[in-house]
């Protein structure tokens, strides 16, 4: 038997893949345990192993089937359950009825590259991954700047407040590195929250032009 | 649906081993638990090993445990059974099978199945 507290929270992607991770504060060391899906209105059932991402937390991917088919929708509604393993038995951990498109974290932005640089500015695009077309255009972007000599925690947060999938860069000094991340959140869902930041994008700013500031 | 080929099966000696392999396509693999039946002229189908979708946790038939091992590389769509120590009464057609629910997995009708591999052992 387990105590402590237990804290199981999942995130959908929009598409075809359930993140969930799972907390137990009595940690269970060498127990097999999995999480399932059971969705209210499809008839398919998918379970994936918890695997250990800290002394006390759990995680897996539900793969719901190939990276862009939209396998849930708005109206979708999916029992998980953490089961583990007692000898021959199998127990439930934990539940929630899942509302995956309340519960929304999408991929991590892809494909960033810098269209346009000059000595004080940068004109950079990207892409998303595996967003349903449900959202339309109702998606929110955040972006960050990495300036030398500060962390990405010091770098202030540029909020693009509708789906724009570039964005210019201002006021940055010459000949000097940066790197470049966003993120994305759809504006639907309660419990939504942002994707993971992009890979970073390094690039450098144009040197300025002798006895000339461009 | 995944569909699945399996190979690696033949006429051996008892004591002897095999490996036979499974070869996923058609979907993502990783979603599915797989599995390995074997079926012996006259009798049911028979649930001999599993191994869940990361590969970390493994289930055994009583009769084949501590003889055989099953494994999978997600990076070749493929699942494992190494057979050693065989005897006489490993004899048997053996079959690949998937399925997204882990639970369900010893459920014959649940499953996606191979066409099978023959495997006889000689006495």
């Known amino acids: 038997a387990v105590n402590g507290t237990s804290q199981f929270t999942c995130f959908y992607n929009s598409r075809a893949n359930i993140s969930c991770v799972w907390s137990q504060d009595g940690a269970l060391q060498d127990t097999s345990c999995q999480v399932h899906a059971w969705p209210d209105r499809r008839r398919w059932n998918q379970t994936c192993e918890l695997l250990p991402v800290s002394q006390a937390s759990w995680a897996c991917n539900l793969i719901l089937g190939a990276p862009d088919s939209q396998k849930l929708t708005t109206v979708d509604i999916v029992t998980l359950r953490v089961l583990c393993r007692e000898g021959v038995r199998w127990r439930v951990m934990a539940i929630q009825d899942f509302k995956p498109f309340e519960n929304l974290r999408l991929m991590a932005p892809i494909s960033l590259q810098v269209v346009h640089v000059e000595t004080h500015r940068c004109n950079i695009s990207w892409e998303i991954s595996q967003a349903s077309h449900y959202f339309e255009r109702h998606l929110e972007f955040e972006a960050r700047t990495l300036s030398p000599g500060h962390t990405w925690e010091e770098a202030p947060l540029l909020t693009l407040k509708q789906k724009q999938e570039w964005i210019c860069l201002e006021t940055l000094t010459p000949d000097t590195q940066y790197e470049f991340q966003v993120r994305v959140k759809p504006l639907q869902g309660e419990f939504t929250t942002w994707s993971p930041w992009s890979q970073p994008l390094a690039f450098r700013t144009k040197p300025a032009a002798l006895g000339k500031d461009t | 649906e995944v569909q699945l080929v399996e190979s690696g099966g033949g006429l051996v000696q008892a004591g002897g081993s095999l490996r036979l392999s499974c070869a996923a396509s058609?979907?993502?693999?990783?979603?599915?638990?797989m599995a390995w039946f074997r079926q012996a002229p006259g009798k049911e189908r028979e649930f001999v090993a599993s191994?869940?979708?990361?590969?970390?946790?493994?289930d055994y038939g009583d009769s084949v445990k501590g003889r055989f091992t099953v494994s999978r590389d997600n990076a070749k769509n493929t699942v494992y059974l190494q057979m050693n120590n065989l005897k006489p009464e490993d004899t048997a057609v053996y079959y690949c099978?998937?399925?997204?629910?882990?639970?369900?997995?010893?459920?014959?009708?649940?499953?996606?199945w191979g066409q099978g591999t023959q495997v006889t052992v000689s006495s």
């Open positions: 099978a998937a399925n997204t629910d882990y639970f369900q997995i010893r459920s014959l009708d649940a499953n996606t």
């Open positions: 058609g979907d993502v693999f990783v979603r599915y638990t």
């Open positions: 191994v869940t979708d990361s590969g970390r946790t493994t």
